[in-house]
Interface confidence: low
Amino acid sequence: QEFLLRVEPQNPVLSAGGSLFVNCSTDCPSSEKIALETSLSKELVASGMGWAAFNLSNVTGNSRILCSVYCNGSQITGSSNITVYRLPERVELAPLPPWQPVGQNFTLRCQVEDGSPRTSLTVVLLRWEEELSRQPAVEEPAEVTATVLASRDDHGAPFSCRTELDMQPQGLGLFVNTSAPRQLRTFVLPVTPPRLVAPRFLEVETSWPVDCTLDGLFPASEAQVYLALGDQMLNATVMNHGDTLTATATATARADQEGAREIVCNVTLGGERREARENLTVFSFLGPIVNLSEPTAHEGSTVTVSCMAGARVQVTLDGVPAAAPGQPAQLQLNATESDDGRSFFCSATLEVDGEFLHRNSSVQLRVLYGPKIDRATCPQHLKWKDKTRHVLQCQARGNPYPELRCLKEGSSREVPVGIPFFVNVTHNGTYQCQASSSRGKYTLVVVMDIEAGSSH
């Protein structure tokens, strides 16, 4: 009769470093001590006729254990294969490019250290939860790669690497390890430069909007914009609308920037840069300033009118040009009554980069002169009917403007000037019409001849 030596459990699977309870038993009636043959650390836990129980500890690798016993002068053996499974110690997705151009391939690279049994270990590369590649882990460490075509949809997508240790055939389930995700940033930067809209000329100490626009940019919100006037960086407001980026800034020219300058717009995305430059002339245009030697002149005095402006500016005063650009224009006159209220006009012209810029200014002269009564406006002999309504039309002039009063000779009777009044025979007589101001008096004699109305 043949007797058997059973080893239980048969072909167990356990986690690396774990312990295993092993039972060896035989139906041989005359069995001696049962031995466990293994290099593993073991401890006899219990034994009896035809059986022995052992505890194996710190099982770190695959191993074959053998139980043996002597029965009727011969040895019988039984064996069991221990399979140890080990989860990977490191599952890591290699860093992704900081920025990946849309439409170009990039490589996902996953490194797996340790993990056994290798035949049951699979490496999966993922975008979100979508499988991009599934490959067995072969070497140690295992490296698995996949080539991916970058798209807009990949911007901000998490990529990760997962290991699957499939111990389901052994009844232990599927052990999954996942790497830390890495986020991809994709971008589109057109080859065309930005559209830079800037003034051709900018006056010192003035401001003007500058616009820089680039279409077909993705993601527009991530782009960096640098706007500058010469070496002066401009404070830009950046707005995105879809794939269009618009940067707006206000350029203010300083006095030290006068001359030919450049406005620069740089758009940087994904470590790449697009640049646009526009020429700009910063100019200074002072004046024109029109001056009178006496804003208020006395009649007969000499008045000098001068007009000046900044360098390179050609001025023309009342049609008379200055000798050369940058020079003042002057004229002199003897102030007369007719010059009172006269305006002097000065125009200034500056050539900037082939364009002519114009500005105007004016000043008004006041001339002080004594009172006068215009005989043409003041009849010296009036024939009016009694009990009728009339107006004494007399006008005085002068600067300062004179007061005009008409008083009857030999009495203090006054008739209104320029206002309708009722005439009667008592108005008959000679009147002194006197215009007076701080600059003197002027008298004109007016005779009123009042014709009595017919009595009924």
């Epitope: 003007w208 909007p209 500058v210 626009t213 707006t248 500005r359």
Partner: antibody
Framework: QVQLVQSGAEVKKPGASVKVSCKAS????????MHWVRQAPGQGLEWMGY????????EYNQRFQKRVTITADTSTSTAYMELSSLRSEDTAVYYC????????????WGQGTLVTVSS | DIQMTQSPSSLSASVGDRVTITCSAS?????IYWYQQKPGKAPKLLIY???NLASGVPSRFSGSGSGTDFTLTISSLQPEDFATYYC?????????FGQGTKLEIK
């Protein structure tokens, strides 16, 4: 929001002058140039001139050079257009319009002021 | 002065039609602008810098061209599109407008 509000309709005799106002609100008045455009009844648009309120710099269409004056009062954010020596052919709707920088063209317009020149 | 000539001067079309208005400059310009005007109203900016839609303008409007020849296209006419359209340049003073194209219902 940006608004340009113009003064009311005017009836003038030939030889007289008219002054139309345009009050701006909703933006910084000195930053943008103000243009004036007119439209005779049943006709197209005709540009008259503009002012930079920041500097009082003006440019005019030579057709109006001697007769038009554009001014601006920054304290009230108001632009003015004065047309002198009026003739019957100046009968038109006069518009003020803001130039929003090269990117935007004449992006905001006043409601228009009808000026009628008749003896 | 740069003259801007639009063609046609007037045009009859139906709702849903595709319409093209051309604008020709007497000398080369960098950009043009298009405006829409309805009777009794101020003009409204449609397109700036030749091809950019102004804020709030429907995408059925588009602009193109360069140098001296420019076009405004309405891909599918809507009832509210019947109006007068003007092109404008400001390469040099004076700023000039085209004479206008009146778009009427057929």
């Amino acid at each position: 929001q940006v608004q340009l509000v113009q003064s009311g309709a005017e009836v003038k005799k030939p030889g007289a002058s008219v002054k139309v106002s345009c009050k701006a609100s909703g933006y910084t008045f000195t930053v943008y140039w103000m243009h004036w455009v007119r439209q005779a009844p049943g006709q197209g648009l005709e540009w008259m001139g503009y002012i930079n309120p920041n500097t009082d710099y003006t440019e005019y269409n030579q057709r109006f050079q001697k007769r038009v004056t554009i001014t601006a009062d920054t304290s009230t954010s108001t632009a003015y257009m004065e047309l002198s020596s009026l003739r019957s052919e100046d009968t038109a709707v006069y518009y003020c319009a803001r130039w929003g920088g090269n990117s935007y063209g004449l992006d905001y317009w006043g409601q228009g002021t009808l000026v009628t020149v008749s003896s | 002065d740069i003259q801007m000539t639009q063609s046609p001067s007037s045009l009859s079309a139906s709702v849903g039609d595709r319409v093209t208005i051309t604008c020709s400059a007497s000398s080369s310009v960098s950009y043009i602008y298009w405006y829409q005007q309805k009777p009794g109203k101020a003009p409204k900016l449609l397109i700036y810098l030749t091809s950019n839609l102004a804020s709030g303008v429907p995408s059925r409007f588009s602009g193109s061209g360069s140098g001296t020849d420019f076009t405004l296209t309405i891909s599918s006419l809507q009832p509210e599109d019947f109006a007068t359209y003007y092109c404008q340049q400001w390469k040099s003073i004076p700023l000039t407008f085209g004479q206008g194209t009146k778009l009427e219902i057929k």
